[in-house]
């Protein structure tokens, strides 16, 4: 069975084809090759003789037991080599020779028992080494690591490391890898020698499900003393053994680390007193809780010095009391409990993401809701009912505003966005908005992107609501049940590049409303009911137009519409997916491609 | 279509069939078997995925006695610092995991419950597997 040609001459997918040897009928120009799940078993010298251009090679689950000297020799362009799930028993010293550009080596679940004997010391270009799910017992980083000066990611998770000693990290003292991210999760740790991490600098350290008791956790965290880490991730996994007890003593040792960003990811434990618990983390710049349950919500009004707070997928009794002077970014998403938003006091806040919480807002939006006048980014998408009772008083700095899939009330009663002269991006898609007021977008003079799909208009008619949006480049009006539009609806949109009118109820096409769109490049009219043209003579679309989508419409392939069908043929170079432009009527031509139709109509004498 | 039996409990019988053409082997055990009146137990899964599990989600299509419920999307793996350790599993890596579950106080009416589970993962998104579970419910007292 042949391999699947994904990108001709470049990418080949040969997964699970029962190959016992490397295929010999693929072009020399192949750059990406997936040979996973084939019983190759043995890689001899110059196994990839015929693949000089190879960049990505996937050998996952190929039952490889032996890799000989020079197996990948002369693959000088290879950047990614994946060996996941191979029961390697014999790995020659020169197994990885010739890989002069290798950046990513994945040797997950390959029976690797030690880093010491892993022959990768010459791979100077290596950026990512993943040796997770192996049998490694010692965390001693071998001397050859001093050659791996580009290493950024080292994944040692799910191994058998129990202890870390001062000597294990000696090589890092000799060549501080300023950018190294280290994942030690799911190793059964019980001892970290104090001083082992002293004066070590890491970009990221992840320790999840490493400790089987609170005491072990406490002593191991104390053993991290002296570490300088940009981002520290602690926590557990839902499907692994969890700590039976967790209290403030667990994290006391963090006072002896220098941490820029902290994240606690999943804890099967109710956090009650977070002030005491995170006492050593009051001055990290970014603080993040993922999938934890928080009992006392008042604690977030303590004088923490955080600039970024992230609360994701957490459980709260009610919406937390947030009073944080220095906070610039707040991400509060996918949380449960506390369905009603209550005012927060965050005077420095610039970025606020409150999406996916099922929250309802009694009144939105003004500076008193968020306690700031500095807000630039506000995401309230995928929430409950949001009643628009204020026109963003004090929030004039806003540049990005997203309400999609929330239920907006009172949107068409006044110019809600009147004061948002700096707004660049607005998404009100699927917000149950019924446009009945022409001044709905007044004030949005800087707006570049407007998404309003899935809403409705009075009498299914698009009026002149965009007159002030002179900088608009992207407009989505899909799924709005539109049947007609004002001939001057788009007259002021001379910068518009993309217009999506798909999934509406237009029965005819007219070029007239688009005559002023001098920058229009993409016009999507798919999934309408277009049968013919509005006027007998269709003009040309703007000369800038490059893509016109008329697929899945109800073309009437009859003589009376011959000029329209001819006009469509004349637009051939603009049309996308022409094979999905089919006749709907008459019944004998139903399903026939419009462009292949040869309509010869007799003139009645 | 071959039917794979999972388990029987006092009020339910659970089995599944594959609804994709690949039918990559997957081993599912529930201990103790689910009782629909209330249940607490462990779900054990052994599986070798054909793609990375990063950004795994399930599309669930549930039918209750021939009545179709709306499609549900259950996100399991968001893509970073996920709740489940198997979210970091790579294509070809053995996934051998136990997940605890519990629910109580749901009253199910007697009948046949079908649940099609489409597992989607990776970037670009592609189907990982598709299983159709059938639960025959015989409530002893309802």
């Amino acid at each position: 069975e042949p391999c699947v040609e994904v990108v001709p001459n470049i990418t080949y997918q040969c997964m699970e084809l029962n190959f016992y040897k490397i295929p010999d009928n693929l072009p020399f120009s192949t750059k990406n090759l997936d040979l996973s799940f084939n019983p190759l078993r043995h890689l001899g010298s110059y196994s990839f003789f015929s693949f000089p251009e190879l960049q990505v090679l996937d050998l996952s689950r190929c039952e490889i037991q032996t890799i000989e000297d020079g197996a990948y020799q002369s693959l000088s362009h290879l950047s990614t080599l994946i060996l996941t799930g191979n029961p390697i028993q014999s790995l020659a010293l020169g197994a990885f020779s010739g890989l002069s550009s290798l950046q990513k080596l994945v040797a997950v679940e390959t029976n690797l028992a030690s880093l010491e004997n892993f022959p990768i010391g010459h791979l100077k270009t290596l950026k990512e080494l993943n040796v997770a799910h192996n049998l490694i017992q010692s965390f001693k980083l071998p001397e050859y690591f001093s050659n791996l000066t580009n290493l950024e990611h080292l994944d040692l998770s799910s191994n058998k490391i129990q202890s870390i000693y001062c000597t294990d990290l000696r090589v890092l003292h000799q060549m501080p890898l300023l950018n190294l991210s280290l994942d030690l999760s799911l190793n059964p740790m019980n001892f970290i020698q104090p001083g082992a991490f002293k004066e070590i600098r890491l970009h990221k350290l992840t320790l999840r499900n490493n400790f089987d008791s609170l005491n072990v956790m406490k002593t191991c965290i104390q053993g991290l003393a002296g570490l300088e880490v940009h981002r520290l991730v602690l926590g557990e996994f839902r499907n692994e053994g969890n700590l039976e007890k967790f209290d403030k003593s667990a994290l006391e040792g963090l006072c002896n680390l220098t941490i820029e960003e902290f994240r606690l990811a999943y804890l099967d434990y109710y956090l009650d007193d977070i002030i005491d618990l995170f006492n050593c983390l009051t001055n990290v710049s970014s603080f993040s809780l993922v999938s934890v349950t928080i009992e006392r919500v008042k604690d977030f009004s303590y004088n923490f010095g955080w600039q970024h707070l992230e609360l994701v997928n957490c459980k709260f009794g009610q919406f937390p009391t947030l009073k944080l002077k220095s906070l610039k970014r707040l991400t509060f998403t996918s949380n449960k409990g506390g369905n009603a938003f209550s005012e927060v006091d965050l005077p420095s806040l610039e970025f606020l993401d409150l999406s996916r919480n099922g929250l309802s807002f009694k009144g939105c939006c003004s500076q008193s809701d968020f306690g700031t006048t500095s807000l630039k980014y506000l995401d309230l998408s995928f929430n409950g009912v949001i009643t628009m009772s204020s026109n963003f008083l004090g929030l004039e700095q806003l540049e990005h505003l997203d309400f999609q899939h929330s239920n907006l009330k009172q949107m068409s009663e006044f110019s809600v966005f009147l004061s948002l002269r700096n707004l660049i991006y607005l998404d009100i898609s699927h917000t149950h908005t019924r446009v009945a007021f022409n001044g709905i977008f007044n004030g949005l003079s800087s707006l570049e992107v407007l998404k309003m799909a899935g809403n409705s208009f009075q009498e299914n008619f698009l009026p002149d609501i965009f007159t002030e949006l002179r900088n608009l480049t992207f407009l989505d009006l899909s799924q709005c049940q539109l049947e007609q539009l004002s001939p001057t609806a788009f007259n002021s949109l001379s910068s518009l590049q993309v217009l999506n009118m798909s999934h509406n109820n237009f029965f005819s096409l007219d070029t007239f409303p688009y005559k002023c769109l001098n920058s229009l490049q993409v016009l999507d009219y798919s999934l309408n009911h277009i049968m013919t043209s509005k006027k007998q003579e269709l003009q040309h679309f703007p000369s800038s137009l490059a893509f016109l989508n008329l697929t899945q419409n109800d073309f009437a392939c009859t003589c009376e519409h011959q000029s329209f069908l001819q006009w469509i043929k004349d637009q051939r170079q603009l049309l996308v997916e022409v094979e999905r432009m089919e006749c709907a009527t008459p019944s004998d031509k139903q399903g026939m491609p419009v462009l292949s139709l040869n309509i010869t109509c007799q003139m009645n004498k | 279509q071959k039917q794979y039996w999972v388990c029987n409990s006092s009020d339910a019988s659970i089995s599944y069939t594959y609804c994709d053409k690949m039918q990559y082997p997957i081993s599912i055990n529930v201990n103790p078997c689910i009782e629909l009146k209330r249940s607490k137990g462990l779900l054990h899964i052994f599986y070798i995925p054909r793609r990375d599990l990063k950004q795994l989600y399930f599309n669930l299509y549930i039918t209750v006695n021939t009545m179709n419920l709306p499609k549900r999307k259950e996100v399991i793996c968001r893509g970073s610092d996920d709740d489940y350790s198997f979210c970091r599993a790579l294509k070809g890596e053995t996934v051998n995991t136990t997940i605890s579950f519990s629910f109580k106080g749901i009253k199910f009416s007697k009948g046949k419950y079908k649940c099609v589970v489409e597992a989607i993962s990776g970037s670009p998104e592609e189907m990982l597997f598709c299983l159709e579970f059938v639960i025959l419910h015989q409530p002893n007292s309802n």
């Epitope: 010999d24 003789f49 015929s50 | -």
Partner: nanobody, 117 residues
Framework: EVQLVESGGGLVQPGGSLRLSCAAS????????MGWFRQAPGKEREHVAL????????YYADSVKGRFTISRDNAKNTVYLQMNSLRPEDTAVYYC??????????WGQGTQVTVSS
């Protein structure tokens, strides 16, 4: 078994030309691809050019494109490498290699090419 014998190497001035030959003998029916590789002192062996016996498709490394030409004479079981516009950086031992249908690779003993004024 496949035996490969190279010839044609030597000393040449920059801008000059050489033609290398590689004669194959033994189980030549099993050969799928043949090619020229080179190895400069202290460096890894690298692809120069490849040719597929079955359909004649060809590959050249970027560094030799437009200057070197690989060809084959099936009647003589020989593969050639015509090297024009030679540069000092082309100095290396040139090896002929052959890959069989069983993924086994055979090598010649190598021939020295030196480009120097």
């Amino acid at each position: 078994e496949v035996q490969l014998v190279e010839s044609g190497g030597g000393l040449v001035q920059p801008g000059g030309s050489l033609r290398l030959s590689c004669a194959a003998s033994g189980s030549i029916f099993s050969i799928n691809d043949m090619g020229w590789f080179r190895q400069a002192p202290g460096k890894e062996r690298e692809h120069v050019a490849l040719i597929r016996i079955k359909d004649g498709s060809i590959y050249y490394a970027d560094s030799v494109k437009g200057r070197f030409t690989i060809s084959r004479d099936n009647a003589k079981n020989t593969v050639y490498l015509q090297m024009n516009s030679l540069r000092p950086e082309d100095t290396a031992v040139y090896y002929c290699g052959a890959k069989t249908g069983t993924s086994f690779v055979y090598w010649g003993q190598g021939t020295q090419v030196t480009v120097s004024s």
